[in-house]
Interface confidence: medium
């Protein structure tokens, strides 16, 4: 069996002259009975590996790969063109020889016929060989066209995959940057909210202190058992959790990028695995994108949760402050009403004092009258024997305007014939 190397592209054509029919075979004509055509094994498309590492390495690797692909394509095109040229040349030769043969056949047989017979046999044999060769070259050309189409399609697919991978990579970088910016933004927000809470807490504490001082002055003890919300601790805990999450995500992303770049750089030489790995990587990227999207959604969720907690804390704080204000207003109203009542009582007591003074004067007058009468008349007169005098005295302990506690003592003295026969004391403790 005759073996012939076709090109340097490591592909062999196995051509068996024994299998090829040695008979008149021209393009367009069928291979005769008993013909076996041994086909050239076409080269597999030359796979290439695109390097997806860092931008610089990527460009260099890709340029190199593209250059080798271009060179391969040019070689395939050149081979293709040379096959076509060979076929055309052989076809022309066939035509010329066929025409020559027909001319010879058309001529009348002469004495020279025998002389040319051997030459004619040789020419026919050569024509058959050329026809068979032409058919084989045509098959090779078609097979090469098929391989070329496969290579081109694969190259297109791989270029698309590379572009997709680059776009994905850019998208991941952007996502990572956005996540970092979002984290920083959230940290700033948290800080400003903490600052605001500290400020509100300070105001709240001052208001409470002020209220306590006012209440102490008015000697009204109102105890409000309200637990102060420990906002700072809660926020610190939430912030710690968030930072841990964000840091973990960042480290994971960085680690992933580093390992991915290393993997892709190492894989640049493994041309035969390009399509499989590119697709596998594309799926990985998609999964990573989904994972990063989930992480991002989770962070957004955490952020929303934090903001919701902050809003709730603020609302709670506002509600508590409002309740303190209401309590204070209520106390002030009650205090005012107590003051008014006290003033009313004081007025009443003043009136009673006036009555008492009037009575005291009257009693003193009666006493004097009685004493005068006793001196003048030796016989005692029983005019006032049944007279009952009730002496009421009002003792008020110092009424200080600053205090709302009053002690009122009402003393009742019952006298008959100038003698005290009954004395009673009533003490009123008024608390307002």
């Amino acid at each position: 069996m005759e073996r012939r190397r076709i090109t340097s592209a490591a592909r062999r054509s196995y051509v068996s002259s024994g299998e090829m029919m040695v008979g008149g075979l021209a393009p367009g004509r069928r291979l005769g009975p008993g013909t076996r055509l041994s086909l050239a094994r076409m080269p597999p498309p030359l796979p290439t590996r695109v390097d997806f590492s860092l931008a610089g390495a990527l460009n260099a690797g890709f340029k190199e790969t593209r250059a080798s692909e271009r060179a391969e394509m040019m070689e395939l095109n050149d081979r293709f063109a040379s096959y076509i040229e060979k076929v055309r040349f052989l076809e022309q030769q066939n035509k010329a020889l066929a025409a020559e043969l027909n001319q010879l056949r058309a001529k009348e047989p002469t004495k020279l016929a025998d002389v040319y017979q051997a030459e004619l046999r040789e020419l026919r044999l050569r024509l058959d060989q050329l026809t068979a060769n032409s058919a084989r070259l045509e098959v090779e050309r078609d097979n090469l066209a098929q391989d070329l189409a496969t290579v081109r399609q694969k190259l297109q697919d791989e270029t698309n995959l590379r572009l997709e991978a680059e776009n994905n990579l850019a998208a991941y970088r952007q996502e990572a940057d956005e996540a970092t910016l979002a984290r920083l933004d959230l940290e700033r927000k948290i800080e400003s909210l903490e600052e605001e809470i500290r400020f509100l807490r300070k105001i709240h504490e001052e208001e409470v202190r002020e209220l306590q001082e006012q209440l102490a002055r008015q000697q009204v003890h109102v105890e409000l058992d309200v637990a102060k919300p420990d906002l700072t601790a809660a926020l610190k805990e939430i912030r710690t959790q968030y930072e841990a999450m964000a840091s973990s995500n960042m480290h994971e992303a960085e680690e992933w990028y580093r390992s991915k770049f290393a993997d892709l750089t190492d894989a640049a030489a493994r041309n035969a695995e390009l399509l499989r790995q590119a697709k596998h990587e594309a799926n990985d990227y998609r999964r990573q994108l989904q994972s990063l999207t989930c992480d991002l959604e989770s962070l957004r969720g955490t952020n929303e949760s934090l903001e919701r907690q902050m809003r709730e804390q603020e609302e709670r704080h506002v509600r508590e402050a409002a309740s303190y204000q209401e309590a204070l207003a209520r106390l002030e109203e009650e205090g005012q009403s107590l003051k008014d009542e006290m003033a009313r009582h004081l007025q009443e007591y003043q009136d009673l004092l006036n009555v008492k003074l009037a009575l005291d004067i009257e009693i003193a007058t009666y006493r004097k009258l009685l004493e005068g009468e006793e001196n003048r008349i030796t016989i005692p007169v029983q005019t006032f024997s049944n007279l009952q005098i009730r002496e009421t005295s009002l003792d008020t302990k110092s009424v200080s305007e600053g205090h709302l506690k009053r002690n009122i003592v009402v003393k009742t003295v019952e006298m008959r014939d100038g003698e005290v026969i009954k004395e009673s004391k009533q003490e009123h403790k008024d608390v307002m």
Epitope: L31, T35, R41, P44, A145
Partner: antibody
Framework: EVILVESGGGLVKPGGSLKVSCAVS????????MSWVRQTPEKRLEWVAS???????YYPDNVKGRFTISRDNARNIMYLQMSSLRSEDTAMYFC??????????WGQGTTLTVSS | DIVMTQSHKFMSTSVGDRVSITCKAS??????VAWYQQKPGQSLKLLIY???YRYIGVPDRFTGSGSGTDFTFTINSVQAEDLAVYYC?????????FGTGTKLELK
């Protein structure tokens, strides 16, 4: 997108003739060799004929002289003219892109039934 | 003629399994072998050519190997959509010939 569509199949009596066609799109038809492959009712695959881009034809012995493959590069159509049909020619006939090589793309097939 | 023999007409497998289909040529065909997939009621689809090269758009779970007379087609992790008939084909010399086919079924 590469598309190959066969047509012209049907029921034929033994000894009869039939011409099936394969219309193609999605690639430069004139650059590629084309073939016909059939699948018997028992699901066996058999190569029927091939034609190179330049028009050279190739057949296995069992159809040689009875079947003729041809192509019209201007209309992007390939044909298979079948004559002296036998019951063993009953099959699903597929057209495929590729000559004496691997077949990268296949049509959906057209059915030929040879029966009296 | 070169005869392509697929020893197993049927092969049982489960989703996720690794399965290998063999094909033996009656004489040396170098690496001029292709593998095709045919799903019920459908046309054929080229998966592997030149014994070990995946065709355009073919998932990487499909692999081919061998040269000379012994060839193997492997599915690394069988998916439900891989249940079909698989044919080997030699294009080393005319007449072009095909294997009898191996039907992949679920256990």
């Amino acid at each position: 997108e590469v598309i190959l569509v066969e047509s012209g199949g049907g029921l034929v009596k033994p000894g009869g003739s039939l011409k099936v066609s394969c219309a193609v799109s999605g690639f430069t038809f004139s650059n590629f060799a084309m073939s016909w492959v059939r699948q018997t009712p028992e699901k066996r695959l058999e190569w029927v004929a091939s034609i190179s881009s330049g028009g050279t034809t190739y057949y296995p012995d069992n159809v040689k002289g009875r079947f003729t493959i041809s192509r019209d590069n201007a209309r992007n159509i390939m044909y298979l003219q079948m004559s002296s049909l036998r019951s063993e020619d009953t099959a699903m006939y597929f057209c495929a892109r590729g000559g004496l090589h691997y077949f990268g793309y296949w049509g959906q097939g057209t059915t030929l039934t040879v029966s009296s | 003629d070169i005869v392509m023999t697929q020893s197993h007409k049927f092969m049982s497998t489960s989703v996720g399994d690794r399965v290998s289909i063999t094909c033996k040529a009656s004489q040396d065909v170098n690496t001029a072998v292709a593998w095709y997939q045919q799903k019920p009621g459908q046309s054929l689809k080229l998966l592997i050519y030149s014994a070990s090269y995946r065709y355009i758009g073919v998932p990487d779970r499909f692999t081919g190997s061998g040269s000379g007379t012994d060839f193997t087609f492997t599915i690394n992790s069988v998916q439900a959509e891989d249940l079909a008939v698989y044919y080997c084909h030699q294009y080393y010399s005319t007449p072009l010939t095909f294997g009898t086919g191996t039907k992949l079924e679920l256990k």
